[in-house]
């Protein structure tokens, strides 16, 4: 249950978060599961533990394996497992499936491609973006914070997109790359498995305490009239109406039919007077139709006055 897959490339930085969390004051111990050997905390080591984070600076193929993290709370020792695989760099341009993060789908209206895992790193804008190994150039492509925006999306924009950034640790720089597929839907009159355009999977949404915040769950279900389609929000796995927090309400948006004909729905989650404890909740955007259910999870983080890092 508390296990997480992580992967990276040799000679790049890889940072893994313990699947169990805890207060900053809690001690987190990391072990290499196969040998039960403790991971050092001294930063002079190439692989070291830093609280909830396990850092490979840089990673080596031999680092692959299962790592155990134990969060020592005042009552229980809470255990998580990080299954880490480090791959050799490919000589050709193709990115193998096992290095790919989740596929995102876009439309003319919504074409954000988020750089996976970037929030774990100490990086500075701008990001570099590549499509099928070619650096993206032209006014249609805009690197904004941790995502890429493509204007006037066309079917030809489908492909594998790689973000590249530099992680800085105590003055030393390490390269990180992450790749995910981007698909564009443009067939005639069809129904497909829901595609959540927003939020991105595991998105971190910045909010200000005391202010109001809106989260939009936007999903597309195909072209033309859809027999059954719905989008909704859940809080910690519970329906909004059952959660019982009057400050948090969902409000149905308008049915949208984009210029390329996609049938999409929006659901806006309105949080009035954001409180600290709202940052601890898990917000799930659910999209469902006859094909099935897709879920994207969002967490809130406090907006810092100066946003150096993701």
């Amino acid at each position: 249950k508390f296990s997480k897959q992580s992967w990276g490339l040799e000679n790049e930085a890889l940072i893994v978060r313990c699947p169990r969390q805890g207060k900053p004051s809690y001690t987190v111990d990391w072990y290499y599961s196969q040998t039960n050997k403790s991971i050092p905390t001294q930063e002079r080591n190439r692989v070291f533990a830093s609280g909830q984070l396990l850092k490979f600076l840089p990673a080596a193929v031999a680092d692959s394996g299962i790592y155990t993290c134990i969060v020592r709370s005042p009552t229980f020792n809470r255990t998580g497992y990080a299954n880490v695989t480090i791959y050799k760099k490919q000589s050709d341009c193709n990115v193998p499936d096992y290095l790919m993060y989740s596929t995102v789908s876009g439309s003319e209206k919504n074409s954000k491609i988020y750089c996976p895992t970037i929030d774990l790193y100490n990086w500075t804008a701008p990001l570099e973006w590549f499509k099928n190994c070619q650096a993206l150039q032209g006014s249609r492509y805009r690197a904004h914070k941790s995502f890429l925006v493509i204007d006037n999306v066309m079917t030809e924009d489908a492909g594998d997109y790689t973000c590249k950034f530099i992680h800085n640790e105590n003055g030393a720089n390490y390269s990180v790359t992450a790749t995910r597929s981007f698909t564009v839907k443009d067939e005639q009159g069809f129904s497909l498995f829901p595609v959540i355009g927003a939020p991105a999977q595991n998105e971190i949404k910045e909010v200000e305490i005391g202010k109001n915040a809106n989260l939009t769950c936007s999903a597309c279900f195909g072209k033309g009239t859809q027999f059954l389609a719905a989008v909704l929000w859940q809080l910690n796995g519970t329906k909004i109406t059952d959660f019982g927090e009057p400050r948090i309400q969902q409000e149905e948006g308008q049915n949208q039919s984009f210029s390329n004909g996609l049938a999409c729905l929006d659901m806006v989650l309105r949080i009035a007077d954001v409180k600290e404890e709202d940052l601890l909740l898990q917000y799930d955007c659910l999209a469902l139709n006859l094909h099935g259910l897709r879920r994207h999870t969002v967490r809130l983080s406090r907006k810092n006055p100066i946003d150096h890092h993701s």
């Epitope: 805890g22 207060k23 969060v71 005042p74 009552t75 809470r78 519970t238 601890l280």
Partner: antibody, heavy 121, light 106 residues
């Protein structure tokens, strides 16, 4: 809506045992540790211990360690607290309670309605 | 075991007045939680992690402190604030509560 519903009041004789139940709903039972807190009449709150329903692991307050047993039934999302060798000073309201967000131990946000246990000869 | 001492035992104030409740700890803790309890009811979470206001709690309640000394402040008392208030530490096992401060409204 998170709910913790406890069993009804009990009257026990000294030396007997009592088993209080706490049925959880509105969340995934195995994702949150459940704690037991008691309150004697006119007195303060006293933490008795906690159980991880996923594993059945327990941590007890040393004061009760010899007499308390906490268990959890995953199939019914119900936690139990059994206290043995009862004495008059065990007369109290017994609460089951849960943190708001488990891994952060951010105070007891959800409480059962309480179960009054009276120990009298 | 960490011993929590709350003072005063009873606080009697008029509506609109400021109430300051103290919680002293026998050894340093990282966080403090505060609860309100009214007769015949289960405790209610007021403040968690020293200063964070729980959902649905009015802004007149605030918490502060560090180390061994923590404070719950009610900036302007309302009649419905009459209750017993408890501090609690979750720093080490066993978890412990203070003896409580009873707030009376004149």
């Amino acid at each position: 809506q998170v709910q913790l519903v406890q069993s009804g009041a009990e009257v026990k004789k000294p030396g007997a045992s009592v088993k209080v139940s706490c049925k959880a709903s509105g969340y995934t039972f195995t994702d949150y540790e459940l704690h037991w807190v008691r309150q004697a009449p006119g007195q303060g709150l006293e933490w008795m211990g906690t159980i991880d329903p996923e594993t059945g692991d327990t941590v007890y307050n040393q004061k009760f360690k010899a007499r308390v047993t906490m268990t959890a039934d995953k199939s019914t999302s119900t936690a139990y607290m059994e206290l043995s060798s009862l004495r008059s000073e065990d007369t109290a309201v017994y609460y089951c309670t849960r943190a708001f967000y488990n891994d952060y131990d951010d105070a007891f946000a959800y409480w059962g309605q309480g179960t009054l246990v009276t120990v009298s000869s | 075991e960490i011993v929590m001492t709350q003072s005063p035992a009873t606080l009697s104030l008029s509506p609109g007045e400021r109430a300051t409740l103290s919680c002293s700890v026998s050894s340093s803790v990282s966080y403090m939680h505060w609860y309100q309890q009214k007769p015949g009811q289960a405790p209610r979470r007021l403040i968690y992690d020293t200063s964070k206001l729980a959902s649905g709690i009015p802004a007149r309640f605030s918490g502060s402190g560090s180390g061994t000394d923590y404070t719950l402040t009610i900036s302007s008392l309302e009649p419905e604030d009459a209750a017993v208030y408890y501090c609690q530490q979750w720093n080490t096992s066993p978890l412990t509560f203070g003896g409580g401060t009873k707030v009376e409204i004149k």
